[in-house]
């Protein structure tokens, strides 16, 4: 199994501040920086293919060894094609070597070939022709090799050029050990571990799951203590075997027909809900029988459930250009409780038998769709028109099936909504009157009729007809309040009456406005 | 011997279009990456255009970007220089330029392309 | 864009003269940078690429350093055939900008 990896040297993550040494100094491998996925790469590189008889050499860092015995080296290089070069570079290599030092001091800049060891010939599997290195596609080659027992305080890892043309852009070293072992359903691999000190002899290793297992959902992954000995102890955290399986032992088995798990969990497989079918071996979940729903927020251990039947009982009562619906909630709820009601409106014209949607036009006193009281008023409904409102019920499976569950209920309107009057404006002689009413309903009313007369005098009044939205009413007496109701008339007849409203003129010549 | 011949220039009034080629021969065209380069008189020199060797990718230089296209032909061993929309600072000598990564010894490709070969170049003059 | 500064912008020297021009890139460009001859009526020529590596057939006399944002041309003994301009082009970016030119002139 692969060990806890402990990386002792990591030229790719040192982005280019690591100096390594080169020999002879000014030829051969250089650092070089490039672009690569938008982001500036570091490599050392040599490509002196046509100048014959090369021997350049590239020398780390001294590395610490720590308490590794055996080291990993992993390197990330690429080599170019020698017929990539005009005449094919004759003198053009395609491989360089590794070498290692040991020692337990840093020579600095001390050099000397002859206290290398070659660890192997680095050849690529693949190597960069013309058309991958003019489109910049790096063809990069991983190779690694394995070095010990060491047994100094460090070492130096070193890389000669005898004439290729190479890139190196990842060398890595580093140590593992410590044996495999199965603990709570993890498997924890082979590492080796260095005492962090004398207090902390242990190396945390997290552990991976056994086959079917898993860490649960926001909990602490497996893991061992791994000492210096090579011993594991203190284990913490779990796995837990996955959906559609239960644990048996230090294994995860598949759970058996007509039970399922839908999660990983400690707890065994449950039997199949109510309106499921009998599931097979392991399951994650159990069929819905026909007719029958999961709404995807259910949890897999509900019951299924189906769409609500209508709803029971409707009503409309109408109130000028209102309209108040009440329904009860259907006799067959489906077996759930996120019962919602969605009101659509339908007008017909009397004269032509025309119908349309109305929504656009009408105002509700709350959102129609997933409304979860069961009554809701229509205001805004144009006069002498014939409305048809549809209630459907649905719950949380409602979308998974084409047909609808609804009742309907028809109305018709006769009367126009009562103006809303304004006082714009006064002097000591005049009143300044404005109205509005709904836009659906002005194109049925045909004049607009303005009645007013003195506060107290149940004698006399005056009418005033417009087509418009505003009147001034002259030659009325200075600081008197005068009652004024505006009411809209249509070609049926008239329709409903505005509040009657209190105005007063001014008593003597001042501000000619008011705000309203 | 690696030879590339410009031609195509000439006077021009502004907003005229003008089609440059160049016409390559002594080495294998459908290898190089292709290139125009400009001299206005008695100044440096500007990096124009570029094209892969397959015909693609492309790129600009901001001041032609939209008015000029740069394409090829590798069965004609010939490179065009498409202008369109032509401006009074667009006059210079036009050079056609070629790279070839068989004679770049470096073992990763650099982020674009230097010219190792060069045209002796056509005069392209904007006015009215 | 990556701007290039070279300078001098014009300098006279004698035959056999140690002759440097430098170039400065208005960030770093690692070592791709390429120097360029030109002589009057006649098209650019190549000489050195990658910040130091001469291109087939330039002779030796000509050499190139630096990396980042300063890079140097040297003519270590100029010969009469050297009085021309010379500029550096940067290529880590695909604007490849030039540099304005050092014209070296007969003294």
């Known amino acids: 199994a692969q060990g806890k990896e402990v990386v002792l040297l990591d030229f790719a993550a040192m982005k280019g501040e690591l100096g390594w040494l080169t020999h002879p100094y000014g030829k051969g491998w250089d650092l070089m920086q490039n672009i690569m996925n938008d982001m500036p790469i570091y490599m050392y590189s040599v490509c002196n293919v046509v100048s014959g008889d090369q021997d350049n050499w590239l020398r780390t860092n001294w590395v610490y060894r720590e308490e590794a015995e055996r080291i990993f080296i992993e390197l990330k290089f690429t080599v170019r094609d020698c017929n990539s070069f005009p005449g094919g570079a004759s003198s053009c290599k395609e491989t360089f070597n590794l070498y290692y030092a040991e020692s337990d001091v840093d020579y600095g800049t001390n050099f000397q070939k002859r206290q290398f060891t070659k660890i192997d010939t680095i050849a690529p599997d693949e190597i960069t022709v013309s058309s991958d290195f003019e489109a910049r596609n790096v063809k990069l080659n991983v190779e690694e090799r394995m070095v010990g027992p060491l047994t100094r305080k460090g070492f130096y890892l070193a890389f000669q050029d005898i004439g290729a043309c190479v890139a190196l852009l990842s060398v890595r070293v580093y140590y593992k050990k410590c044996p495999e072992m199965l603990q709570s359903l993890a498997r924890f691999p082979e590492t080796i571990a260095v005492a962090v000190s004398d207090a902390q002899p242990l190396a945390t290793v997290a552990g991976t799951c056994v086959d079917h297992a898993v860490v649960p959902y926001g909990g602490e992954g497996p893991l061992m203590h791994c000492t210096v000995d090579g011993e594991w102890l203190v284990p913490i955290g779990q796995c837990l075997c996955q959906e559609g399986y239960e644990k048996v032992e230090d294994a995860c088995q598949a759970c058996s027909p007509g039970f399922f798990k839908s999660e990983a969990s400690e707890s065994p497989c449950l039997q199949c809900p109510e309106h499921t079918l009998p599931s097979t071996e392991g399951a994650t979940s159990c069929q819905c029988e026909e007719g029958y729903f999961r709404a995807p927020e259910d949890p897999l251990s509900m019951p299924c459930t189906r769409p609500p039947s209508a709803p029971h009982y409707l009503t409309a009562i109408g109130m000028g250009a209102k309209v108040e619906l009440r329904w009860t909630a259907p006799q067959d709820t489906g077996g759930r409780k996120d019962i919602v009601y969605s009101v659509t409106c339908e007008q017909c014209w009397p004269e032509s038998g025309e119908c349309g949607s109305c929504e656009a036009s009408v105002q509700y006193s709350e959102p129609p769709q997933a409304l979860t009281r069961t009554s809701v008023t229509v205001s805004d409904l144009e006069p002498h028109m014939n409305y048809t409102f549809t209630v459907e019920a649905r719950n949380g499976v409602s979308d998974l099936v084409n047909s609808r569950s609804f009742r309907t209920a028809s109305v018709s309107i006769n009367q126009t909504e009562p103006p809303k009057v304004r006082l714009e404006d006064r002097s000591t002689t005049s009143l300044s009157v404005a109205w509005s009413i709904p836009v659906p309903q002005q194109s049925r009313v045909w004049k607009y009729e303005v009645t007013y007369r003195k506060k107290g005098d149940a004698n006399s009044y005056n009418v005033h007809r417009t087509d418009g939205f505003s009147v001034t009413l002259d030659g009325l007496a200075p600081g008197t309040t005068y009652l004024v109701q505006v009411q809209a008339l249509t070609q049926e007849g008239q329709g409903a009456g505005s509040k009657v409203h209190e105005f007063q003129t001014l008593s003597t010549e001042g501000s000619a406005t008011m705000a309203v | 011997e690696v030879q590339l011949l410009e031609s195509g220039g000439g006077l021009v009034q502004p907003g005229g279009s003008l089609r440059l080629s160049c016409a390559a021969s002594g080495f294998t065209f459908s290898h190089y990456m292709m290139a125009w380069v400009r001299q206005a008189p008695g100044k440096g020199l500007e990096w124009v255009s570029r094209?892969?060797?397959?015909?693609?990718?492309?790129h600009y230089a901001d001041s032609v970007k939209g008015r000029f296209t740069i394409s090829r032909d590798n069965s004609k061993n010939t490179l065009y220089l498409q202008m369109n929309s032509l401006r009074a600072e667009d006059t210079a000598v036009y050079y056609c330029?070629?790279?070839?990564?068989?004679?770049?010894?470096?073992?990763?490709?650099?982020?674009?392309?230097?010219?190792?070969?060069w045209g002796q170049g056509t005069l392209v003059t904007v006015s009215s | 864009d990556i701007q290039m500064t070279q300078s001098p912008s014009s300098l006279s020297a004698s035959v056999g003269d140690r002759v440097t021009i430098t170039c400065r890139a208005s960030?770093?460009?690692?070592?791709?940078l390429a120097w360029y001859q030109q002589k009057p009526g006649k098209a650019p020529k190549l000489l050195i690429y990658k910040a130091s590596n001469l291109h087939t057939g330039v002779p030796s006399r000509f050499s190139g350093s630096g990396s980042g944002t300063e890079f140097s041309l040297t003519i270590s003994g100029l010969q009469p055939d050297d009085f021309a301009t010379y500029y550096c082009q940067q290529y880590n970016s695909y604007s490849r900008t030039f540099g304005q030119g050092t014209k070296v002139e007969i003294k």
């Open positions: 094209i892969g060797p397959s015909g693609g990718p492309t």
């Open positions: 960030q770093s460009i690692s070592t791709w």
């Open positions: 330029a070629g790279y070839d990564s068989g004679y770049d010894y470096v073992a990763v490709a650099g982020p674009a392309e230097y010219f190792q070969h």
